[in-house]
Interface confidence: medium
Amino acid sequence: KKVVLGKKGDTVELTCTASQKKSIQFHWKNSNQIKILGNQGSFLTKGPSKLNDRADSRRSLWDQGNFPLIIKNLKIEDSDTYICEVEDQKEEVQLLVFGLTANSDTHLLQGQSLTLTLESPPGSSPSVQCRSPRGKNIQGGKTLSVSQLELQDSGTWTCTVLQNQKKVEFKIDIVVLAFQKASSIVYKKEGEQVEFSFPLAFTVEKLTGSGELWWQAERASSSKSWITFDLKNKEVSVKRVTQDPKLQMGKKLPLHLTLPQALPQYAGSGNLTLALEAKTGKLHQEVNLVVMRATQLQKNLTCEVWGPTSPKLMLSLKLENKEAKVSKREKAVWVLNPEAGMWQCLLSDSGQVLLESNIKVLPTWSTPVQP
């Protein structure tokens, strides 16, 4: 018996061939011997089966001795043995229809779980295998679960159902809702304007929700909410903002925040959360601010940084075009009795300068000038 696999919602064509290459009488029946369709001369006739409005044939092939049964908009319950009667012969074809669906929305938050459920006809014992867009293979039976979805899991999942050495393939588009970056760090000199950007890693027609930025300043004992906002059809409106600092927020996506000036008391870490309408859970992006200050007080030239710096970062003080006078893996360095000239304070990571602040030291009879 020939086995044919079909996909729920698709169209399948079951073949039936006579030895004579001409139009002769044929009938297609189901396993209960109920007539589905056949012919009377050159006319297509249909029987009382439940497939009535979804069954068809190709009259153009009858003259070649081919009498296919076409079933449209396949349903799981169409799985059956179909019998073609032609020239006193019976050709049996077993049709097995499968469906694969995501049992929740196909738009899922980063970290959530995806469950794919296989609908299969009674008596079948298929195995399913899916491959994610990043090339991760997973295998299962009637259900297949993937926990802790990552951004790279966004895209088309290719799933293969195997039954009786035959395969049928499904494609499911999954969108993982997340920010493009889990974490970012901004390096600024004291007094500079700070831009925080929170680009999303997905695009949807309408985006509605609400968000908040909580900030833990390095100098503060507890975190506080700096701003809350609403998002309606990709339009941003501020609900509440602190007076110090007074953040400004862009009205359109991507989410964009401006801190008028970087000050040591603002250095620290923030967590922007975004709750989307009709979704449980929130999107998160961490943002860090590192602030640098270079000062000269009497005979002491000091360079300091505040905020979450890695222990491998190097802080240096050097006179322009000269070797570093002092270089330490610390958050403050200083030089006593600095020579006159333009001094540079540098924060660097493996030789790459992340932040630079210049201060002019005048001869001892003058006062310092900070450009």
């Epitope: 090339g135 991760k136 295998q139 290719t158 293969t160 393939e169």
Partner: antibody, heavy 118, light 108 residues
């Protein structure tokens, strides 16, 4: 008889391009994942690329952005377009079939040699 | 990236002896996605075992595979002269689909 035959190897200068082909016969080509695997002289096997039955493609970091795998089911053919070639790409390149339902690489070609040298 | 390490690098044995080859993964691999290959000089590799323990078509039953998680083993119960070759394990559970560096089985 199930068979894979690679062609297109040769000598190319660093920075140059080459297109490898793999002709498949004896099986329904469109039903199988196909892979390229390479082996430098005296070294082990290194996976280079995979193309799924749905046309989905996968590469390791070492070739990503330089190599492109493609398939032409109507011609039972697999291809590997290799650009910006480096000396480190010198190897025998094998075309292989992914076994039914991704179960290992069950059919291999005889390989074609690519030499990148000035 | 899942790294595979094979041990020993070389196994020197005589025909008739038992060979035990190890493949260790840097992170857990579903046993469904672990394969073993044999390669002789000047030839393409040949699939021996897929799914960690299933023999490929035409592979003699002296070859067997076992293991799960991060530790997998290929056993050749009685070495035949034609079994002296290099053996590679491969994981195809997660891209990049890495191979182990190989174990050479040679004559003692």
């Amino acid at each position: 008889e199930v068979q894979l035959v690679e062609s297109g190897g040769g000598l190319v200068q660093p920075g140059g391009s080459l297109r490898l082909s793999c002709a498949a016969s004896g099986f329904t080509f469109s039903n199988y994942d196909m892979h390229w695997v390479r082996q430098a002289t005296g070294k082990g096997l290194e996976w280079v690329s995979t193309i799924g039955t749905a046309g989905d493609t996968y590469y390791p970091g070492s070739v990503k952005g330089r190599f492109t795998i493609s398939r032409e089911n109507a011609k039972n053919s697999l291809y590997l377009q290799m650009n910006s070639l480096r000396a480190g790409d010198t190897a025998v390149y094998y075309c292989a079939r992914g076994g039914d339902f991704y179960y290992g690489l069950d059919v291999w070609g005889q390989g074609t040699t690519v030499t990148v040298s000035s | 990236e899942i790294m595979l390490t094979q041990s020993p690098g070389t196994l020197s044995l005589s025909p008739g002896e038992r060979a035990t080859l190890s493949c260790r993964a840097s992170q857990s691999v579903s046993s469904v996605y672990l394969a073993w290959y044999q390669q002789k000089p000047g030839q393409a590799p040949r699939l021996l075992i897929y799914g960690a323990s299933s023999r490929a078509t035409g592979i003699p039953d002296r070859f067997s595979g076992s293991g799960s998680g991060t530790d997998f083993t290929l056993t050749i119960s009685r070495l035949e002269p034609e079994d002296f070759a290099v053996y590679y394990c491969q994981q195809y559970g997660s891209s990049p689909f890495t191979f182990g560096p190989g174990t050479k089985v040679d004559f003692k």
